[in-house]
């Protein structure tokens, strides 16, 4: 009877050992989970499917760099610096996907692009570099192409509701589209400085028949063409003083 | 009796703690002492008094400087950057005094200076500065001195047995002296690749009259005037890999 | 510098580091762009001298002790960062540094 | 962010800062220039909730633990270096930074 | 036209270091990545490296300690560099507009260039 | 190191049939589909026919379909017609710079 109940202790031992094993593995992800999300600030994990993600996603040359700047599977994670920064995350790219605005809407209703909001977290002086990225569906044919990005302003006495932000001219050849950037630095620094003058762009991107061949609201087949703004800022976290 | 017993136990959790509290103060700062040995490299404490480090400590601007740079109480801690480097301290100035060297003999036995080793550890890429300081003993009247560095050099067939370095002229009026840098750099950095070429260095710095200046074996009154070298390194801290 | 690294099947009694990976497709997190999945790593062990730690400044002598702490113990010595890229469900993308998430060295302290 | 500071009539019973000024001449270590002092801190107090963690990669489940640690304990999450002026015993006084030589914050890890 | 051209040796003894151009046109390259791709012959496609629209390199495993891929944007000019060739390297060398595997990347090839390692 | 392993390695069928390609990867592909196929003919560089696992290349005949997602994918070329005699290749992404191209099919027409 000693030796069985011996057995069972042990037995016991092991199973203790093992549920300990799992129990303190899931509360250790679930530890670094929540930590997670306090150090990104964020509430509780953004609700977002993975469709949601695929629709969003930019398929543009920024995206790519981001995801490939560093090994996903950072199996060399010994030679990270020691922790050289504060308890929060620090942002150094932000890629802002264009919402729909009260201003930007066209004459049956149906919103236009493009209106980007910003959180009055970003400085204006931390901007190193915003490029606006727009793709330009394919051509059949040899043509050129007249890029022009438009800032929504009140309207003037005149009536003119629009100022130009940038105009370029390309050259497009028949095959897949391709993605442009636009150096906005200015503007969204001016937006940054006073909010309300950001009221929305419009695209445009006539071929020589006039038609537009900028993506603004994704077709069938366009998921993750949309415009985006692309913004590099120099994060430097605030030293926490007692 | 209860309430004695009690009264034991309170006075007796009073001097435990009080105890407690002492022991442990000692014990951190015994541990602290340790770690700071550990993180200097050094096995024990230097062995120095109080009387050598004042004839050894050189009174002259790098060292004011290098006291003055930082709040020496560090009132506010709290300011410091979180921990960026690995265990080990970082090296920023390496400030050398002369040695004795064989090579340099006088021709009545009497040491010559001055010769200066160095650790293997510098690296003669990570310099970023090598100066010599000099102490010129105080003029009666205004004069003009001539300083020469000398470097020593394996006898040529001409006989041969020094190679200038630099060489400066400068006007000095009466008072106190004057501390006096060089800068050695190239010098430095030659002695590094190749050590067996570091014989040595000769300092002059004579007046109009041919007395020299120099102080390069302090007499009475002139400690802390012997002539260093300042060294300031770049010391990126390895990372140390697993 | 010192620190002991270990795997699950160790039978180091002492403070080491272990594998930890963290999966976040495995939990659901597809807001999380980039890594999918990182190693965290994590420390476990017994803390028995005090010439053994890091950092002294949390070093307590096993005796009558006021404030229940109980003396060195198995502890991150060194970190480092992750990069991330991930929805911060505001219509954006961030891509940012998240400081402490790997633990690349234990000690005691 | 987080992390408590205290002092030594504090009657706080959580992971705490406390202050503690290392003081080299009182010990006779007239080799280290400067600093001759510096306020080194240390922490102290208890720990009880995973959630208070900044470092979530020591927590271990309070059950039965084959590696006897004893679940998250006070310990520094942000240290700071020091800058000292020393003799190193070889005709040299060296001017350099020492890492993690002051407690900036305490917290459960 | 959108065109890539690939120029550079023939042949490249052992050891020795090759450089390969990969010159466009119709092509901005501050918003195009090229890719280097090679094929040994009768063999499959190997990838070899990329350098983005932002200038950033990213090398294959087995080329990271011999590659550097850099690029002149005023020229329209992307510059391979291999050291210490062998002749394993013999192989068709392709550049590649945009990241095969990403998006729409791989639409556009040179013809390639057939670079002989021997001696 | 990724291995993204192709079967069959050769293909033999008569025009019209269906052909299945396979492309197997020893881990899964960024986001599950960064995933693309490549055509290719003796003499001539690769030709971009699917990318994004499913999606078909501008000027791409409408019998080429792509599939699959994680580290299991296919094209099907519906109804093969003679001059889709070539070598078929498939190219995966991972994140962190790592690319790979699959050894390849060579589908033959009898």
């Known amino acids: 009877e000693g030796s069985e109940r011996e057995e069972n202790v042990e037995k016991e031992g092991l199973c203790n050992a093992c549920a300990w094993r799992q129990n303190t593995r899931y509360s250790r992800i679930e530890a670094i989970k929540i930590q997670i999300l306090s150090k990104l600030r964020l509430e509780t994990a953004p609700n977002i499917s993975k469709d949601a993600i695929r629709q969003l996603l930019p398929r543009a040359p920024p995206l790519r760099e981001l995801i490939d700047q560093y090994d996903v599977q950072r199996d060399d994670s010994s030679d990270g610096s020691l922790e050289d920064d504060d308890y929060h995350a620090t942002t150094e790219t932000i890629i802002t996907m264009p919402t729909e605005s009260d201003f930007l809407m066209q004459a049956d209703g149906k919103p236009k692009c493009c209106f980007f909001k910003f959180s009055s977290k970003i400085q204006y002086n931390k901007v190193v570099k915003a490029q606006l990225w727009i793709y330009l569906r394919p051509v059949k044919t040899p043509t050129t192409v007249f890029v022009q990005i438009l800032r929504l302003i009140k309207p003037m006495k005149d009536g003119t509701r629009y100022t130009g932000i940038r105009s370029l001219k390309l050259d497009m050849s028949p095959g897949t589209g391709i993605w442009q950037s636009i150096d906005v630095k200015t503007v969204l620094q001016n937006w940054l400085k006073q909010p309300e003058s950001n009221l929305g762009i419009e695209i445009k991107a006539l071929d020589e028949n006039g038609h537009d061949l900028a993506v603004t609201f994704p077709g069938p087949g366009e998921d993750g063409l949309n415009p985006f703004l692309e913004v590099k800022v120099t994060d430097t976290p605030k030293r926490s003083r007692r | 009796e209860g309430s004695e017993r009690e009264e034991n136990v309170e006075k007796e959790g009073l001097c435990n703690a009080c105890a407690w509290r002492q022991n442990t103060r000692y014990s951190r700062i015994e541990a602290i002492k340790i770690q700071i040995l550990s993180k200097l490299r050094l096995e024990t404490a230097p062995n120095i008094s109080k009387d050598a480090i004042r004839q050894l400590l050189p009174r002259a601007p790098p060292l004011r400087e290098l006291i003055d740079q930082y709040d020496v109480q560090r009132d506010d801690s709290s300011d410091g950057s979180l921990e960026d480097d690995d265990y080990h301290a970082t090296t920023e100035t390496i400030i050398t005094m002369p040695t004795e060297s064989d090579f340099l003999m006088q021709a009545d036995g009497k040491p010559k200076c001055c010769f200066f080793k160095f650790s293997s550890k510098i690296q003669y890429n990570k310099v970023v500065k090598a100066q010599l300081w000099i102490y010129l003993r105080p003029v009666k009247t205004p004069t003009t001195v001539f300083v020469q560095i000398l470097r020593l050099i394996k006898p040529m067939k001409d006989g041969t047995r020094y190679t200038g370095i630099r060489s400066l002229k400068l006007d000095m009026s009466p008072g106190t002296g004057i501390w006096q840098s060089i800068d050695v750099k190239t010098v430095l950095q030659n002695w590094l690749k190749q050590p067996e070429s570091n014989l040595g260095i000769e300092i002059k710095a004579l007046d109009e009259n041919g007395h020299d200046l120099a102080v390069t074996f302090p007499g009475p009154g002139e400690d802390g005037l012997n002539p260093f070298l300042e060294v300031k390194v770049t010391d990126t801290p390895k990372r140390s890999r697993r | 510098d010192f620190g002991l690294d270990c795997d699950e099947h160790s039978t180091e009694s002492r403070c080491c580091r272990y594998p930890l990976t963290v999966d976040f497709e495995a939990f659901g997190w597809d807001w999380i762009i980039a890594p999918k999945r990182y190693k965290a790593n994590y420390c476990s062990g017994e803390c028995e001298f005090v010439f053994l730690q890091k950092y002294p400044h949390t070093h307590l002598v096993h005796q009558a002790n006021p404030r229940g702490s109980a003396g060195p113990c198995c502890t991150p010595t060194k970190m480092s960062p992750i990069n991330m890229l991930y929805f911060n469900g505001k219509e954006q993308i961030i891509y940012g540094k998240i400081p402490a998430m790997v633990v690349d060295r234990c000690g005691c302290s | 962010d987080f992390g408590l500071d205290c002092d030594e009539h504090s009657t706080e019973s959580r992971c705490c800062r406390y202050p503690l000024t290392v003081d080299f001449e009182a010990f006779g270590w007239d080799w280290i220039i400067a600093p001759k002092r510096y306020k080194a801190n240390y922490c102290s107090g208890e720990c009880e909730f995973v959630f208070l963690q900044k470092y979530p990669h020591t927590h271990l489940v309070h059950q039965a633990n084959p590696r006897g640690s004893a679940g998250p304990c006070c310990t520094p999450t942000k240290m700071s270096p020091i800058n000292m002026l020393y003799f190193n015993g070889k005709e040299q006084i060296i001017y350099g930074k020492i890492p993690a030589m002051v407690v900036d914050r305490c917290g459960c890890s | 036209q959108v065109t890539l051209k690939e120029s550079g040796p023939v042949l490249v003894k052992p050891t020795e270091t090759l450089t390969l151009t990969c010159t466009v046109s119709?092509?901005?390259?501050?918003?195009?990545?090229i890719s280097w791709v090679r094929q040994a012959p009768g063999k499959g496609l190997e990838w070899v490296g990329i350098?983005?629209?932002?200038?950033?390199?990213y090398y294959a495993s087995w080329a990271k300690k011999r590659l550097t891929i850099s690029k002149d944007t005023s020229k329209n000019q992307v510059v391979l560099t291999m050291t210490n060739m062998d002749p394993v390297d013999t192989a068709t060398y392709y550049c590649?507009?945009?990241?095969?595997?990403?998006?729409?990347?791989?639409?556009?090839w040179g013809q390639g260039t057939l670079v002989t390692v021997s001696s | 190191d990724i291995v993204m392993t192709q079967s069959p390695a050769t293909l033999s069928l008569s025009p019209g049939e269906r052909a299945t390609l396979s492309c197997t990867s020893s881990q899964s592909v960024y986001h599950a589909n960064w995933l693309s196929w490549f055509q290719q003919k003796p003499g001539q560089p690769p030709k971009l026919l699917i990318y994004w696992a499913s999606t078909l290349a501008y000027g791409v005949p409408s019998r080429f379909s792509g599939s699959g997602s994680g580290t299991d994918f296919t094209l099907t070329i519906s109804s093969l017609q003679p001059e889709d005699a070539a070598t078929y290749y498939c190219a995966g992404g991972y994140g962190g710079g790592r690319y790979a191209f699959g050894q390849g099919t060579k589908v033959e027409i009898k």
């Open positions: 119709g092509i901005d390259l501050s918003h195009t990545d």
């Open positions: 350098i983005s629209y932002a200038g950033k390199t």
């Open positions: 590649a507009r945009g990241v095969p595997a990403y998006s729409h990347g791989g639409d556009l």
